[in-house]
Interface confidence: low
């Protein structure tokens, strides 16, 4: 179950998704992708507290354990619930092609 | 793609399916689980370093962003890939009832 | 603006019934747990039960006489078989963040329930 | 069930005081405890979430702490906007002990 997004450490400390901005050099991607020559990805970054945003049993489980064992089991993580697409134009043997990625940008986060 | 499972830092190091013995009191479910007294909890613990079992794309994105900005974009994460049903014995007001939760066992491990 | 407004309170005969509701905006019902919660005049607080993604829980005592729904805006109680003891004034409340914790993060104005023959 | 019992059920204090209010729950609840505030007419207004988590926007006079059955929400110096009912909530299981809330404490001026 999806939880809600109030963050308890303070606006904007919890799991969310956040816009960074890469050229295709930061992303290695200089020498295989013609356009866009700069991404905005979508990436879903903070701290994962009690509960918050629990991906599902597992993810309470771990919050149970992380509290009682913190040096044995890590705190849920914040990671991607769901992508959105992106096509990126890149270069091929005999020009360019459009190829569309499912799994490249962050939609939703929740912590796992 | 999923990727190698080479752990550069050594053996065991790296993102894999670990076991953590836990209780019902540790889970604060000894209220409304009956059986099984005692859970082998399998979890995903471990470091992601470059490419180690990434995910897909967006976790190679984030392994070069988090190279170029550490502070800002945290390293990939282990989190499951799968996961093994388990089966409780619940509590309930006229009873007992077998409940399967599909999403409490990690069954396999990638950094995402 | 987060804000929840609750409506459908008033004067109801013992033995009768009402629904109430609470129109949330500026969030989306489908991320959220709802609550109510009721006070009566000059007592404490109340907790009567919970709509979640799966569905709902009550309060031992609310349970039968109390039913909790949602669409897509709205949380609704509805109340039968109306006693005097259930003259308050009724709340609906956002959960902060669900597992296994469920403080109530926002709250409605509340709306004012008498039951009197 | 899980009963709450707060006290004092009210006290009398002037502003700067350091007040504590109690609250102790019939069996063990871990942290999972949220302390609310209301004044007359209107709806609670959350201070407190797991006992000690300070909710957005209150300030840090006010703290909370406790877990297992006994916790405390401390006003470190009374303010005049602090006279008030006060009430702690378990948060823990809804699903086979629900949420009660304790009975309140009302923090009247001396």
């Known amino acids: 179950a999806r939880n809600g997004d109030h963050c308890p450490l303070g606006p904007g400390r919890c799991c969310r998704l956040h816009t960074v901005r890469a050229s295709l050099e930061d992303l290695g991607w200089a020498d295989w992708v013609l356009s866009p020559r700069e991404v905005q990805v979508t990436m879903c970054i903070g701290a994962c507290p009690s509960q918050f945003r629990a991906a599902n049993m597992h993810a309470q489980i771990k919050t149970s354990l992380h509290r009682l064992k913190p040096d044995t089991v890590p705190a849920p993580c914040c990671v991607p619930a769901s992508y959105n697409p992106m096509v990126l134009i890149q270069k091929t043997d005999t020009g360019v092609s459009l190829q569309t990625y499912d799994d490249l940008l962050a939609k939703d986060c929740h912590c796992i | 793609a999923r990727n190698g499972d080479h752990c550069p830092l050594g053996p065991g190091r790296c993102c894999r399916l670990h076991t953590v013995r836990a209780s019902l009191e540790d889970l604060g479910w000894a209220d409304w689980v009956l059986s099984p007294r005692e859970v082998q909890v399998t979890m995903c613990i471990g470091a992601c370093p470059s490419q180690f079992r990434a995910a897909n794309m967006h976790a190679q994105i984030k392994t070069s962003l988090h190279r170029l900005k550490p502070d800002t974009v945290p390293a990939p994460c282990c989190v499951p890939a799968s996961y093994n049903p388990m089966v409780l014995i619940q509590k309930t007001d006229t009873g007992v009832s077998l409940q399967t939760y599909d999403d409490l066992l990690a069954k396999d491990c990638h950094c995402i | 603006e987060v804000q929840l407004v609750e409506s459908g309170g008033g004067l109801v005969k013992p033995g009768g019934s009402l629904r109430l509701s609470c129109a949330a905006s500026?969030?989306?019902?489908?991320?959220?747990?709802m609550s109510w919660v009721r006070q009566a005049p000059g007592k404490g607080l109340e907790w009567i039960g919970m709509?979640?993604?799966?569905g709902t829980t009550y309060a031992t005592w609310a349970k039968g006489r109390f039913t909790i729904s949602k669409d897509s805006s709205t949380v609704y109680l509805q109340i039968n078989s109306l006693k005097t003891e259930d003259t308050a004034v009724y709340f609906c409340?956002?959960?902060?963040?669900?597992?296994?914790?469920?403080?109530?993060?926002?709250w409605g104005q509340g709306t004012l329930v008498t039951v009197s023959s | 069930d899980i009963q709450m019992t707060q006290s004092p059920s009210s006290l009398s204090a002037s502003v700067g005081d350091r007040v504590t209010i109690t609250c102790q729950a019939s069996q063990s609840i871990s942290s999972v405890l949220s302390w609310y505030q209301q004044k007359p007419g209107k709806p609670p207004k959350a201070l407190i979430y797991e006992a000690s988590i300070l909710a957005s926007g209150v300030p840090s006079r006010f703290s909370g702490s406790g877990s297992g059955t006994d916790f405390t929400l401390t006003i470190s110096s009374l303010q005049p906007e602090d006279f008030a009912t006060y009430y702690c909530?378990?948060?823990?299981?809804?699903?086979?002990?629900?949420?009660?809330f304790g009975g309140g404490t009302k923090v009247e001026i001396k």
């Open positions: 500026g969030f989306s019902l489908s991320n959220y747990y």
């Open positions: 409340a956002r959960v902060v963040y669900a597992g296994w914790t469920y403080p109530l993060g926002i």
């Open positions: 909530q378990a948060n823990y299981d809804v699903y086979n002990y629900g949420n009660p």
């Open positions: 709509i979640s993604f799966s």
